[in-house]
């Protein structure tokens, strides 16, 4: 190689300086003994490269460049050759933004799958290849002393949540969590969240049903209709309170809320509907008094409500 | 401490009736579900049914369905198991159980004997 | 029902030995498994719930592991005291049913 590049840092905020250097040795004897060194950054020839020769013979380029915009960018030194541009070495510049910190971290306990899944907002773009890690400790109070650390928990890229297998998990003991972003230019850390998994614990909803007429009982009145629900199973020995929503099919009418229902009513009439019209009912819970976070939706059940009773006039005839 | 005291076991003809109390201590017992648990002499665990909270939803084991029934009284913080048609495959200790959230006794009686014989 | 399945019945071992117990679900219960132990003449104790999560007080050489259908209990280092029978159950549905015991004797 007849040429070489050093350069100031090969990563730099965006916008800032960057001073570059290519040595040409004096082995290079194909060479013009007074070769002129052109630099180039991408397609563009730059200008002001201050060129000097060495007590050992080498010719050294030196340029800076007073704001590096481009986040990625080749800075190559060169001669001319003929009649052509001969590159002797390129480097590769970025430029971005070190992490923000990351924000909005939240987390949610999924009985199912027996994990915690914590997810953040990264912040604005770095231009810059930016790892995020999920870092977390066990503590016996409220986080303030460190118990034992979980192994980091490193999302697939490009995503922004990560979840902590249950193995790394105690129940009912609080943990410290918190994002922590890495790049090139530098580190941050989200603020930390002190939680005991169950109080982030998100249930999966009821299923709802039609209530099955009984003989002995009333069927519904006009503008009613009974409803039922079944609890998710691994979630019934958690008290949970829960509510309805319902709107009429047709129409652009929005939902109408109902509740707070103990899920332990398990039955409920619904009353005040328009009669002989098609509702959509949806139902869905959340662990009560103590925290958590509401579950989705359960899928919806469709009913009618029945007709109004046709009214009879009744004529009083005076003697 | 938590404490979870079982009464009312003793000797039953078949057909009988007996009700099992469970007086609880030492937690707020409005806030947790309930159950019975039972053990045949000599053999494991059964569960016979829980209770929630509040007293409204009441799972029972296939073996006991329609013949027993568990309730609360949760001003006086006692479980109760009443049980009636009584056969002698009911023989055995009845604990009462203090229940978690993930469906787990956390907290046991000592248990009270039932035993149904002519 | 789900079914549990415990094994083995019985096993005989010496105090120092590790010691591993399974119980197999006859339907996936996620983590829904706790495993208690029982002594002769007591009611039983809760060691493990949630399949890993250890209740207070219980001596860290117990363990639980496992998801799904298979899990298993280990005791590291058996101690004296840790000779007794222990019963798997899962909580993922009602009816709540138990594995049938494994009672751990000295040999």
């Known amino acids: 190689e007849c040429g070489h590049i050093s350069v100031s840092a090969p990563i730099v905020h965006l916008g800032d300086p960057i001073t570059a250097s290519c040595i040409i040795k004096q082995n290079c004897s194909h060479l013009d003994p007074e070769p002129q060194i052109l630099w180039r950054l991408g397609a563009e020839l730059q200008p002001g490269g201050r060129q000097q020769r060495l007590s050992d013979g080498t010719q050294e380029s030196i340029i800076t460049l007073p704001h590096l915009n481009h986040t990625q960018a080749f800075l190559s030194c060169a001669l001319n050759w003929g009649n052509s541009l001969q590159i002797l070495d390129q480097v590769e510049l970025r430029a971005g933004y070190p992490p923000a910190i990351p924000h909005n971290l939240s987390c949610l306990m999924n009985l199912t799958t027996s994990s915690l899944i914590c997810q953040w907002e990264p912040g604005p773009e770095t231009h810059l290849p930016t790892s995020f890690t999920l870092k977390s400790f066990k503590s016996r109070g409220n986080c303030q002393t460190q118990g034992d650390s979980i192994l980091d928990c490193v999302p697939k890229d490009g995503q922004s949540h990560c979840s902590i297998p249950r193995k790394h998990l105690l129940l009912y003991q609080n943990m410290g969590i918190w994002v922590q972003a890495e790049n090139a230019l530098g580190t941050s850390m989200s603020p930390q969240l002190c939680l005991d998994p169950m109080d982030v614990v998100k249930l999966e909803p009821p299923m709802l049903r039609t209530m099955d007429p009984s003989p002995e009982a009333a069927p519904p009145q006009a503008g009613c209709l009974q409803l039922s629900w079944e609890p998710w199973q691994p979630g019934l020995h958690i008290n949970q309170k829960c509510e309805l929503r319902h709107k009429p099919q047709r129409g652009e009418a929005s939902w109408a809320l109902v509740g707070p229902l103990p899920l332990e009513a398990l039955q409920y009439e619904l009353c005040g509907l328009l009669p002989a019209t098609a509702y959509t009912l949806q139902i869905r819970c959340i662990r009560w008094p103590l925290p958590g976070h509401w579950s989705d939706w359960s899928p919806s059940l469709e009913l009618r409500t029945t007709e109004r009773a046709p009214t009879h006039h009744h004529h009083h005839h005076h003697h | 401490e938590v404490q979870l005291l079982e009464s009312g076991g003793g000797l039953v003809q078949p057909g009988g009736s007996l009700r099992l109390s469970c007086a609880a201590s030492?937690?707020?017992?409005?806030?947790?579900?309930m159950g019975w648990v039972r053990q045949a002499p000599g053999k494991g665990l059964e569960w016979v049914s829980s209770?929630?909270?509040?007293?409204?939803?009441?799972p029972y084991a296939d073996s006991v369905k329609g013949r027993f029934t568990i309730s609360r009284d949760n001003s006086k913080n006692t479980l109760y198991l009443q049980m009636n048609s009584l056969r002698a495959e009911d023989t055995a200790v009845y604990y009462c159980?203090?229940?978690?959230?993930?469906?787990?006794?956390?907290?046991w009686g000592q248990g009270t004997l039932v035993t149904v014989s002519s | 029902d789900i079914q549990m399945t415990q094994s083995p019945s019985s096993l005989s071992a010496s105090v120092g030995d590790r010691v591993t117990i399974t119980c197999r679900a006859s339907?996936?219960?996620?983590?829904?498994l706790n495993w208690y132990q029982q002594k002769p003449g007591k009611a039983p104790k809760l060691l493990i719930y949630?399949?890993?999560n250890l209740q207070n007080g219980v001596p860290s050489r117990f363990s639980g592991s496992g998801s799904g259908t298979d899990f298993t209990l280990t005791i590291s280092s058996l101690q004296p005291e840790d000779f007794a029978t222990y019963y798997c159950?899962?909580?993922?549905?009602?009816?709540?049913?138990f594995g049938g015991g494994t009672k751990v004797e000295i040999k």
């Open positions: 030492g937690f707020t017992f409005s806030l947790y579900w």
């Open positions: 949630y399949a890993s």
């Open positions: 159950q899962q909580s993922y549905s009602t009816p709540l049913t």
């Open positions: 159980a203090k229940l978690g959230e993930l469906g787990h006794s956390l907290a």
């Open positions: 209770i929630s909270s509040s007293g409204g939803v009441t």
């Open positions: 339907q996936g219960i996620s983590s829904y």
